[in-house]
Interface confidence: medium
């Protein structure tokens, strides 16, 4: 069967997100991938969306992230825009209303996004073959 258009959009967004550092891509998020052995794919997507939502809700107006130059400000706004898009698309793939996220292991946002990108690319290669 063909790959979901949402999946392609997620990979595209993740590629954009992981291309550049901002002042806040090194801030830390809950690492939902550390203990995801007994977790369904839909639960993983749901938890990933929850983590991203927590991040952008907390840091959208964080002065450290907005920076002090026009370039830093623009890059942060772009980061938040991409995270919101990713959040929306992940919810679409998950098809779940909510999911628990335990505050356990920590990962930087950039590492979290790289891990998510690997998972999504694997999923894409399976559905496109």
């Amino acid at each position: 069967h063909k790959c979901d258009i949402t999946l392609q959009e997620i990979i595209k967004t993740l590629n954009s997100l992981t291309e550049q550092k901002t002042l806040c891509t090194e801030l830390t998020v809950t690492d939902i991938f550390a203990a995801s052995k007994n977790t369904t794919e839909k639960e993983t997507f749901c938890r990933a969306a929850t983590v991203l939502r927590q991040f952008y809700s907390h840091h959208e107006k964080d002065t450290r992230c907005l920076g002090a130059t026009a370039q830093q400000f623009h890059r942060h706004k772009q980061l938040i825009r991409f995270l919101k898009r990713l959040d929306r698309n992940l919810w679409g793939l998950a098809g779940l209303n909510s999911c628990p996220v335990k505050e356990a292991n920590q990962s930087t946002l950039e590492n979290f996004l790289e891990r998510l990108k690997t998972i999504m690319r694997e999923k894409y290669s399976k559905c496109s073959s």
């Epitope: 550092k21 901002t22 002042l23 806040c24 891509t25 090194e26 801030l27 830390t28 998020v29 809950t30 927590q54 991040f55 907390h58 840091h59 450290r64 920076g67 830093q72 920590q106 930087t108 946002l109």
Partner: nanobody, 116 residues
Framework: EVQLLESGGGLVQPGGSLRLSCAAS????????MGWARQAPGKGLEWVSW????????YYADSVKGRFTISRDNSKNTLYLQMNSLRAEDTAVYYC?????????WGQGTLVTVSS
């Protein structure tokens, strides 16, 4: 366990300089953005400066821009804040911080008093 230990505070005259240090342990220092915040007597916490792991991106609050310089030595797990042209309004407890997303790890703080 994350530990952040600030030092270098003290009493200084207006126009003077101080260099704050923050010794970090309990985590891989070179992987994380770090920063300084301060709390003046009777006021809220204010972010002063922030630096990413590589040191290539920095943030400064408008109130300290051009006077303060943040830097880090990843080989020594140490964060620095060079403070020049100090003013009375810079008097505060200065905290070293490692942010964990919605959670921040803070040091105990070091007091900087600018007075003649």
């Amino acid at each position: 366990e994350v530990q952040l230990l600030e030092s270098g505070g003290g009493l200084v005259q207006p126009g003077g300089s101080l260099r704050l240090s923050c010794a970090a342990s309990g985590f891989t220092f070179r992987n994380f953005g770090m920063g300084w915040a301060r709390q003046a007597p009777g006021k809220g916490l204010e972010w002063v400066s922030w630096i990413i792991s590589s040191g290539t991106e920095t943030y400064y609050a408008d109130s300290v821009k051009g006077r303060f310089t943040i830097s880090r030595d990843n080989s020594k797990n140490t964060l620095y804040l060079q403070m020049n042209s100090l003013r009375a309004e810079d008097t505060a407890v200065y905290y070293c911080a490692k942010s964990l997303g919605r959670f921040d790890y803070w040091g105990q703080g070091t007091l900087v008093t600018v007075s003649s």
